[in-house]
């Protein structure tokens, strides 16, 4: 979370942004929120990004304006327009490419005066892991798989009963480049588990920590994923 | 209550042919993958075969492998097995039971029917 203040004679306005991570190939968005005004025609909004000259994204006058966007964000940004007048300069970004990563910064002017506040971009891939009964191995198994991820993460077992232990010696963990080169499948084989236990399938790189568990009883299998980002908000 | 109820032994010639049939109330049968286990008088039990619940898939134990095959039909809420090529060390009492997975470590079944008697002699 970054506040910034911004002072235009004796006016200044807040204006918050939140740490965020993209996941490439997919559809972002970079949050900002500033003190909210209802003239919405006085109310410009800039996007910019270290290291690149030219706008990320403008809005003003109660529409966009990019006649000074930068090449590498054509047709990829939107900012919310029906809720720009309650305070919301969050950017919509299509399509997250590694190359989105950096340091952005929300710039707000309205009636009231003016103020800014940067946020940091995390681009990667992360998605929620599946774990199922694997009939493949010879001994009762379960298999965690996941089929995005970058950078490659670490993959780690737990299990509710043996809290503490160790499982790499019974696990087998691999990771396979997608067809765009860039992310990963993850698929990790836990051996020897046995019924009425929850086993868990960690998955985590700098970008984010994902989870999925399982319960195997004579009745049914109970399963469970959670998916959060790291270092956000 | 879970009852499965099994039914089509007999005695029957060496080379012979079977089908034994289990009758399953009491849970949701497509829910749960349905397995055949026997057991040699005096031995212990031994898993036999397995079915998922939309029967995409089958397995069996070695000795089978070639000569039973396992079907289900959830209208019906029964599966079967078909015993072809019989041999006298065939000979058991066939039990069906259910299980979450396909897994089948015999210490993990909790419901058992009656059992079926297959007897293979001449």
């Known amino acids: 979370l970054i506040i910034g203040f911004g002072i235009s004679g004796k006016h200044f306005i807040t204006v918050t942004t939140f740490t965020s991570a993209g996941n490439i190939g997919e559809d972002g968005t970079l949050s900002c929120t500033f003190e909210p005004d209802i003239k919405l025609n006085g109310i410009v909004i800039q996007w910019l990004k270290e290291g690149i000259k030219g706008l990320v994204h403008e809005f003003k006058e109660g529409k966009d304006d990019l006649s000074q966007q930068h090449e590498m964000f054509r047709g990829r940004t939107a900012v919310f327009a029906d809720q720009v007048v309650v305070g919301n300069a969050s950017l919509r970004l299509k399509n997250v490419q590694l190359t989105d990563a950096g340091t952005y910064t929300c710039y707000i002017r309205t009636s009231k005066g003016k103020g800014n506040a940067n946020l940091e971009y995390k681009t990667g891939a992360f998605s929620m892991p599946e774990i199922n009964v694997d009939y493949n191995a010879s001994s009762e198994s379960l298999r965690c798989e996941a089929p995005r991820w970058f950078p490659q993460p670490t993959v780690a077992w737990a299990s509710q009963v043996d809290q503490g232990a160790n499982f790499s010696e019974v696990s087998n963990t691999s990771f396979e480049l997608n067809s765009e080169n860039v992310t990963m499948k993850v698929v990790s084989v836990l051996y020897n588990v046995t019924i009425n236990n929850t086993y868990s399938c960690m998955i985590e790189n700098d970008i984010a920590k994902a989870t999925g568990d399982i319960k195997v009883t004579d009745s049914e299998v109970k399963r469970r994923s959670q998916l959060q980002l790291l270092n956000s908000g | 209550e879970v009852q499965l109820v099994e039914s089509g032994g007999g005695l029957v010639q060496p080379g012979g042919s079977l089908r034994l049939s289990c009758a399953a109330s009491g849970f949701t049968f497509t829910d749960f993958w349905m397995h055949w286990v026997r057991q040699v008088p005096g031995k212990g039990r031994e898993w036999v075969s397995r079915i998922s619940p939309d029967s995409s898939s089958t397995s069996y134990e070695d000795s089978v492998k070639g000569r039973f095959t396992i079907s289900r039909d959830n209208a019906k809420n029964t599966v079967y097995l078909q015993m072809h090529g019989l041999r006298a060390e065939d000979t058991a009492v066939y039990y069906c039971?259910?299980?979450?997975?396909?897994?089948?470590?015999?210490?993990?079944?909790?419901?058992w029917g009656q059992g079926t008697l297959v007897t293979v002699s001449s």
């Open positions: 039971t259910r299980f979450s997975t396909g897994w089948h470590r015999i210490e993990y079944f909790q419901h």
